[in-house]
Interface confidence: medium
């Protein structure tokens, strides 16, 4: 077997791992690197090899991988040594699958929804349990109620609001009280003095094909900063968008395929079809990035086991400008694009 023809300085043809052979040595010490890093095809990450020596083009899905020639982490790939474990010599790049979760000693499969108690509905997503409250308490019965209490009602799961000063008339401080309840989050049961914060979404981890975008938000019941993620696909890898640029033009800002198709993820298929817009390309040095977009929820159905939902970037419009660097560089640091924040969530 050999590595795929992806441009890389680390090609090798290992002998079969038989009794007579010694294990191939993939890392050389001290490091020996070419003077200039390889040029990677669009969408292939330029990364440091597993020896922490040289820049290489990351191995892609189905490619052989070793301790040196590592799989593309920005594509959610890992080196599957299942055919060679525990030798850890040569594996094959495979897609990270959604993993199950364990909560209070009970194991749940990826995408499985369950109720650990009557107050929460939870879903297992890629090893993490996310829960939504089923007891969405309405606001206290009176906005002017100064001392509302949350009390447990016998025979009912969710607590109810009661107001000890029901007989009182509304006072001049009604507006103040309303603001206090908004801040303390009677509806969401948020903590007092919680200043809501949501960062912009990071750029997509790949310039083409399926990637991941993340942001930090504390808009949750505990007011804790948590990382949210969504899938993103700025443009397909298998379409030469340049062919769609109109004569006399240098850019195609938005590319939209003719037909609607299903999204696929880890062998699972979206329950409905979509006709997404993608960012296009330019023939000069400009690059095209989203500037109007939103996040949609896509339901996936798996051939075996339960389905699941994923947040997905939905592009409405793209902008082509000159503030681009080598597209492979955004994989390394995932800095935000300058000057542009997405207009919508």
């Amino acid at each position: 077997t050999a590595l795929s023809p992806t441009p890389t300085t680390m090609t090798f043809t290992p002998a079969p791992l038989e009794e007579t052979t010694t294990r191939p040595e993939f890392c050389k010490w001290p490091c020996e690197c070419p003077q200039s890093p390889p040029r990677c095809p669009l969408g292939v990450s330029l990364i440091t090899d597993g020896c922490e020596c040289c820049k290489i083009c990351a191995q892609q899905l189905g490619d052989n991988c070793t301790e040196a020639a590592i799989c593309d982490p920005h594509r959610g790939l890992y080196c599957d040594y299942s055919g060679d474990r525990p030798r850890y010599a040569i594996g094959v790049c495979a897609q990270v699958v959604g993993v199950g979760c364990v909560l209070d000693g009970v194991r749940y499969t990826n995408g499985e929804s369950f109720q650990p108690n009557c107050r929460y509905n939870c879903t297992c997503i890629d090893g993490t349990v996310g829960c939504t409250p089923l007891c969405l308490s309405p606001r206290p019965p009176r906005l002017w109620c100064r001392q509302p209490r949350h009390v447990r009602v016998p025979g009912q799961c969710c607590e109810q609001w009661v107001c000890d000063d029901d007989a009182r008339r509304p006072r001049q401080t009604a507006l103040l009280d309303t603001r206090a309840f908004a801040a303390s989050g009677a509806v969401e049961q948020r903590y007092e003095n919680c200043i809501a914060y949501t960062s912009p979404w990071s750029p997509c981890s790949t310039t083409c094909g399926l990637g991941i975008s993340t942001r930090i938000s504390n808009v949750n019941a505990r007011c804790w900063p948590e990382q949210e993620s969504r899938l993103c696909n700025l443009r397909p890898c298998d379409v030469d968008i340049q062919l769609h640029i109109k004569a006399g033009k240098k850019c195609l800002a938005v590319y939209q395929p003719e037909e609607a198709t299903n999204f696929t993820l880890a062998g699972c298929v979206s329950t409905r079809t979509y006709r997404p817009k993608y960012c296009g390309v330019c023939t000069d040095n400009r690059c095209c990035i989203p500037y109007k977009s939103k996040t949609i929820s896509v339901d996936f159905q798996c051939p075996e086991g339960p389905g699941f939902s994923r947040q997905v970037l939905w592009i409405n419009a793209c902008f082509c400008n000159l503030s681009c660097r080598n597209p492979n560089d955004i994989f390394a640091d995932l800095e935000s694009y300058p000057d542009f924040e997405e207009i919508a969530n």
Epitope: E18, E19, R23, Y78, P86, Y88, V96, V97
Partner: antibody
């Protein structure tokens, strides 16, 4: 720099369970196996099992089948090893190791009534 | 299970000596053998993998070799920091198994 940082020492009673965590940094967590190994005082190391956070698969040594439960949380780049029905001879230092090259600092688990 | 027989169980050496530790596998393990160094209260540290490949950052006075199912770790010009316990590990098949260890002490 590849680092595996394990949770602190634990003292447990016989029959109880213990859960040791192993936080990985300096590499892509889903790209490598985590192996669990234990070592009793004055003894050689003993392999417990492996897990792969990328594929979601695990494998245990035969003698620990049903007693060692390996899990992980990709959002925290952390692997966990839970051992149930503890006996006094489970007293040992428990290590996690990335593939078989980089090792955590170890977690001492003492089982005593 | 593959049994790894490590000899000797302990040895004494002086700084500057040459030390040899041997591991024998109960069946063929090709070259899938690692050597580790362990100091008291510390985790094992990988020295040699695949029988003879030196792990990054490990001094070149450590070397490994293979002859069939016999594997040798050699430390030439032993230094004060080399006094520790050494283990071999077979990574050919599950379950992964270790040798019983060799304690290298100062003479």
């Amino acid at each position: 720099e590849v680092q595996l940082v394990q949770s602190g020492a634990e003292v447990k009673k016989p029959g109880a369970s213990v859960k040791v965590s192993c936080k990985a940094s300096g590499y892509t967590f889903t790209s490598y196996d985590i192996n669990w190994v234990r070592q009793a005082t004055g003894q050689g190391p003993e392999w417990l099992g492996w897990l792969n956070p990328g594929s979601g698969k695990t494998g245990n040594a035969q003698n620990f089948q049903g007693r060692v439960f390996m899990t992980w949380d990709t959002s925290k780049d952390t692997a966990y090893m839970e051992m149930s029905s503890l006996r006094s001879d489970d007293t040992a230092v428990y290590y996690c190791a990335r593939n078989l090259d980089y090792w955590g600092q170890g977690t001492l688990v003492t089982v005593s009534s | 299970d593959i049994v790894m027989t490590q000899t000797p169980s302990s040895l004494s050496a002086s700084v500057g000596d040459r030390v040899t530790i041997t591991c024998r596998a109960s069946q063929s393990i090709s070259s899938y053998l690692n050597w580790y160094q362990q100091k008291p209260g510390k985790a094992p540290k990988l020295l040699i993998y695949a029988a003879s490949s030196l792990q990054s950052g490990v001094p070149s006075r450590f070397s490994g070799s293979r002859s069939g199912t016999d594997f040798t770790l050699t430390i030439t010009n032993v230094q004060p920091e080399d006094f520790a316990t050494y283990y071999c590990l077979q990574a050919y098949d599950f379950p992964i198994t270790f040798g019983q260890g060799t304690k290298v002490e100062i003479k």
